[in-house]
Amino acid sequence: AELFLIASPSHPTEGSPVTLTCKMPFLQSSDAQFQFCFFRDTRALGPGWSSSPKLQIAAMWKEDTGSYWCEAQTMASKVLRSRRSQINVHRVPVADVSLETQPPGGQVMEGDRLVLICSVAMGTGDITFLWYKGAVGLNLQSKTQRSLTAEYEIPSVRESDAEQYYCVAENGYGPSPSGLVSITVRIPVSRPILMLRAPRAQAAVEDVLELHCEALRGSPPILYWFYHEDITLGSRSAPSGGGASFNLSLTEEHSGNYSCEANNGLGAQRSEAVTLNFTVPTGARSNHLTS
């Protein structure tokens, strides 16, 4: 009696199942009690000897490529051996690599967690994922795993993490890069500093007083509000960051406490108050202001 090994499918793709069947065309296995064993190269597969003429392999990988055969043993211990069958496991090259961010859109608050998720639409086997920072890439990390996605995490984002990023996936057919993704780090405003600028050391009534408010840190645009004794004088915007100024034509009522507030939508901060006092110097006719 002759024995044949049949693999289905005969040309499997990595990660897919394969069924090996040990066939006896001229003998019904039910006619006699047979034990079956399947081999790859020199190694027995699965449970070893079994009464089933089929062996189910859940997932085939590139390294499972090789020469397969089966043996059948009768109760009388006569062993039949099939011819060897070459099974080539086909690897699918990586394709359509993409990089996504968590949070989506690439905008992240300073101190928050950022995850760069590298995905491939196709690709089998061990895929090596690499993450790069900057258009001229600085390699951040690499991971090799049997999955279509991998993650790189920055647990606490800093201002210096604002850059372009991309990832590369590779499974033996050459590296395939994703497109670029830009990360914007949003920084809440720091406590602003208010400075009062007068045209002379002793400002007089009708002088123009400049209130300059500046938050040294914070993502633009920044909106500055100016206050006199908690009454709003007005607001100024700094579209590109930096400070902003508000001009005031002085009258005697302008004595008192001044402050400003910076707000960039990520939080507001109020400056310390600056006091402006009128003083009447001895022998002087006009009122003067000091701060």
């Epitope: 001229v136 590296p175 670029l180 830009s182």
Partner: antibody
Framework: QVQLQQSGPELVKPGASVRISCKAS????????IHWVKQRPGQGLEWIGW????????KYNEKFKGKTTLTADKSSSTAYMQLSSLTSEDSAVYFC????????????WGQGTTLTVSS | DVLMTQTPLSLPVSLGDQASISCRSS???????????LEWYLQKPGQSPKLLIY???NRFSGVPDRFSGSGSGTDFTLKISRVEADDLGVYYC?????????FGGGTKLEIK
């Protein structure tokens, strides 16, 4: 297929401004940086800078800061280069080019836009 | 700025001959990530430049194996083993390691 189509030749007066366009097709516009290169008549090539169309963020060669403004419009997959306060020194052919990261090279170039500054 | 100096300025050759173009940088163009971003481009009259070699010695797809790049640090060479009529034009080296990125002055390959 990938193409970078630049706007036509420009003849402008000294002191004026001009905007040159570079329309990309055949690929995802926001996935790659677009660079600009200057070539004066009979001379070599000078790198001006790049723009990332994903967020419109430009990076300039210090020499061209103030002279050049790079922008990009995602909706039309078009990159722009504006040149201001033009002088005869700005008369040149300007190229846009796509640069592939990781492999790191300019793989596709526009056909070039000739700018002539003359009164 | 990194100055890229190409020699010779002009290179007259006979078809079938070997041609060699040198490119020297004023400082090392090894990037902090360990790569050397040195490229060679060919520009024919009235055309935009075309990539030949990237990262010193990697031939771009479709570029004949007659073209080869070599070098390290500050000294780089482009060799054309058997010059064909289609190879004529101006060759530029380019460094993309240090901003501002810079091109060499060009070498004109012409028929002797």
């Amino acid at each position: 297929q990938v193409q970078l189509q630049q706007s036509g030749p420009e003849l402008v007066k000294p002191g004026a401004s001009v905007r040159i366009s570079c329309k990309a097709s055949g690929y995802t516009f926001t996935s790659y940086n677009i660079h600009w290169v200057k070539q004066r008549p009979g001379q070599g090539l000078e790198w001006i800078g790049w723009i990332y169309p994903g967020d419109g963020n430009p990076k300039y060669n210090e020499k061209f800061k103030g002279k050049t403004t790079l922008t990009a419009d995602k909706s039309s997959s078009t990159a722009y280069m504006q040149l201001s306060s033009l002088t005869s020194e700005d008369s040149a052919v300007y190229f846009c080019a796509r640069r592939i990261h990781y492999y790191d090279y300019f793989d596709y170039w526009g056909q070039g836009t000739t700018l002539t500054v003359s009164s | 700025d990194v100055l890229m100096t190409q020699t010779p300025l002009s290179l007259p050759v006979s078809l079938g001959d070997q041609a060699s173009i040198s490119c020297r940088s004023s400082q090392s163009i090894v990037h902090s990530n360990g790569n050397t971003y040195l490229e060679w481009y060919l520009q024919k009259p009235g055309q935009s430049p075309k990539l030949l070699i990237y990262k010193v010695s990697n031939r771009f797809s479709g570029v004949p194996d007659r073209f080869s790049g070599s070098g390290s640090g500050t000294d780089f060479t482009l060799k054309i083993s058997r010059v064909e009529a289609d190879d004529l034009g101006v060759y530029y080296c380019f460094q993309g390691s240090h901003v501002p990125w810079t091109f060499g002055g060009g070498t004109k390959l012409e028929i002797k």
